[in-house]
């Protein structure tokens, strides 16, 4: 028998969802226009490229990375496309809002967008903790909060710590992971019996799940170098990225093998770890001087995400409710936290090398943003948490958590798709 | 030799439009961000605009914010300043000038406008 | 919006004298300053970055330093060609990228 969508969540979503687009709408029409300087082809084609970059890293990355569950691949793609699609729409009014509005209307450029696609890949990271066990209607609500969260953080940390695009958005990776780690926290926990092969992997959602990683591999680089603000600064965040990703591969895969009693690699470590290298090194990718460091680093970053991934799983489980597969959140915690120290220690050797005595205040600065981060991300994860425990959205029951057939139309209505 | 060079500027009738270009030589121009920055005649210097070396990022000065839309053509080599609803407060002389990176060896990039124009004058008569 | 504030607005001096020029930002920059020399009907000419880091081609006799928010510009021994306008300048993470008012530096 065939799961149906439940009939209270089919007069709330579409409603919720239509209305809010429509609200949308309505505000880019009275508050935003387009950049009318055109002035050179060759160069806004290059702009629109990075744009692009990311949006292969938000939708198809991301999008498939978080698809391996044997029950919930159909589910976990096309939420996070309708997560993106209504995430920057958001993210580029707020931050539109938040920057430029006193003066008058909202200018777009694809400046403006590229940011905007940067803080809905916040959610993305984000809801890898609580995919499968909600439905669209509260992931509307995961997403104007998080994305309000994020940019609100950001224009904080700008105005009181005095940092740039680059540095204020590389705390998306601390922040994603504990807001997503916090909203977990939140929802209801215990599998019922006879649902736990729901959340275990399959064969061919897995290899959709690598192949997500493989894009976002790809496009790392363009990730951690889209907001700098010179070449000199892009050209070293693209190179210090790519080896730090590199070796995190040869790292994931061999420590994977390292750490299972037979030798074996395991996909779930994979998924995550090729990853790490790119994780860690985003907050001082433009600074790193020489190829070695940032290849050492994405050396430790492959080691702390495979040991992650091979001991934190049942911690996580058990305090969160987080599926084994669902590593995203306490990697990109751990590997977050690491780039931020990484970033710390970059500082004092600068600040040393200088002979500017003022060490421990420039250290504190950088301490400040990051507990600031932290901070706001798990209070804004808990009020979200919170609010999608209200009956108001109708939660799938846990007997239906990571179930595709609760949300999706199958003709042939096979009950082990 | 590293050259900016003004041109553009003139009388014009308050409300009217106008618009400088700033030619760049002796230098890669399509790694630089640009400014522009203007100074009325026996008053400090004031900030005016902003552009990215691409050209995908543009900051205004809230006096100008609306009016003055500044953008680039690296092919051509050259900065625009398009300024609209010219009003008497904007006469002044107009600067561009190159933003160059000074790195810092790890925590930082520090920037300057390390090269100026000789700047051309704007009068915006009511 | 940062505004930054240049102490004193006018400084006379002799030739052979050790001058101090403040300037202080409403908030916290760091170190990203600049200070720049303006001869009448010449454009601005950079002499300091980062608050402290002369500018290729300066003298020596310049010489810069502060962080946050207090900084100042000083030349050890003024030369007949040093007699301009100075102004300091933000630049900080995000515009606007405001100028002090500047301070005339005369021959007494």
């Known amino acids: 028998m065939s799961s149906k969508y439940p009939r209270s969540v089919r007069r709330c979503l579409p409603l919720w969802a239509l209305t809010l687009e429509a609200a949308l709408i309505l505000l880019f029409y009275f508050f935003t226009h387009y950049d009318a300087s055109l002035e050179d082809q060759k160069g806004l084609v290059a702009s629109y490229q990075v744009g692009q970059d990311l949006t292969v890293m938000a939708a198809i990355g991301l999008g498939f990375l978080t698809s391996s569950f044997r029950r919930h691949s159909w589910s976990s793609v096309a939420f996070n496309l309708f997560m993106l699609a209504l995430g920057v729409q958001w993210a580029i009014l707020l931050d539109g809002f938040l920057s430029q509005f006193p003066s008058g209307k909202v200018v777009i450029t694809l400046f403006s967008i590229r940011l905007a696609t940067m803080s809905a890949l916040s959610v993305l990271i984000s809801v890898d903790a609580v995919l499968g066990k909600v439905n669209l209607a509260q992931l509307v609500v995961m997403v104007l909060v998080e994305v309000t969260a994020l940019g609100n953080l950001r224009m904080v940390i700008s105005n009181i710590f005095n940092t740039d695009y680059h540095m204020n958005m590389m705390h998306i990776y601390v922040f994603a992971a504990y807001f997503g780690l916090s909203v977990a926290w939140c929802l209801p926990k215990p599998l019922p019996e006879g649902t736990e092969d729901k959340d275990q992997t399959a064969t061919i959602p897995s290899l959709s799940a690598m192949l997500g990683a493989l894009f976002l591999w790809m496009f790392w680089p363009s990730f951690n170098s889209a907001l700098l603000r010179s070449p000199i600064e892009r050209k070293n965040a693209v190179f210090n990225t790519y080896y730090a990703v590199a070796v995190s591969v040869v790292t994931a895969i061999s420590g994977s093998s390292l750490a299972h009693p037979q030798g074996k690699i395991s996909k779930t470590y994979v998924h995550s770890a090729v990853l790490a290298g790119g994780v860690a090194v985003g907050t001082s990718c433009h600074l790193i001087p020489s190829p070695w460091l940032a290849m050492v680093l994405g050396l430790v970053a492959g080691l702390i995400s495979v040991g992650g991934a091979k001991y934190l799983p049942g911690c996580c489980n058990r305090v969160l409710g987080i599926p084994h597969s669902s590593i995203m959140g306490y990697n990109f915690s751990l590997l977050g936290l690491l780039g931020e120290i990484i970033y710390i220690v970059l500082l004092v050797l600068d600040t040393v090398g200088a002979g500017n005595g003022m060490i421990g205040f420039q250290v504190l600065l950088s301490i400040g943003e990051l507990s600031l981060a932290i901070v706001i991300a798990l209070m804004s994860g808990l009020l979200t948490g919170l609010l999608l425990n209200l009956k108001i959205w109708k939660a799938p029951h846990e007997a239906k958590y990571f179930d595709d057939q609760v949300f999706w139309k199958f003709p042939h209505l096979a009950v082990g798709f | 030799e590293v050259q900016l060079v003004e041109s553009g500027g003139g009388v014009v009738q308050s409300g009217r439009s106008l618009r400088l270009s700033c030619a760049a030589s002796?230098?890669?121009?399509?790694?630089?961000?640009m400014h522009w920055v203007r100074q009325a005649p026996g008053k400090g210097l004031e900030w005016v605009a902003f552009?990215?070396?691409?050209?995908?990022?543009?900051y205004y000065a809230d006096s100008v914010k609306g009016r003055f839309t500044i953008s680039r053509d690296n092919s051509k080599n050259t900065l625009y300043l398009q300024m609209d609803g010219l009003r008497a407060e904007d006469s002044a002389v107009y600067y561009c000038a190159r933003e160059e990176i000074a790195a810092r060896l790890y925590s930082r990039y520090h920037y300057a406008m390390d090269v100026w124009g000789q700047g051309t004058m704007v009068t915006v008569s009511s | 919006d940062i505004q930054m504030t240049q102490s004193p607005s006018f400084l006379s001096a002799s030739v052979g004298d050790r001058v101090t020029i403040t300037c202080r930002a409403s908030q916290g920059i760091r170190r990203y300053l600049a200070w720049f020399q303006q001869k009448p009907g010449k454009a601005p000419k950079l002499l300091i970055f980062s608050a402290s880091t002369l500018q290729s081609g300066v003298p020596s006799r310049f010489s810069g330093s502060g962080s946050g928010t207090e900084f100042t510009l000083t030349i050890s021994s003024l030369q007949p060609e040093d007699f301009a306008t100075y102004y300091c300048q933000q630049l900080s993470s995000y515009p606007p990228y405001t100028f002090g008012q500047g301070t005339k530096l005369e021959i007494k």
């Open positions: 552009i990215w070396y691409d050209g995908s990022n543009k």
């Open positions: 002796g230098f890669t121009f399509s790694n630089n961000g």
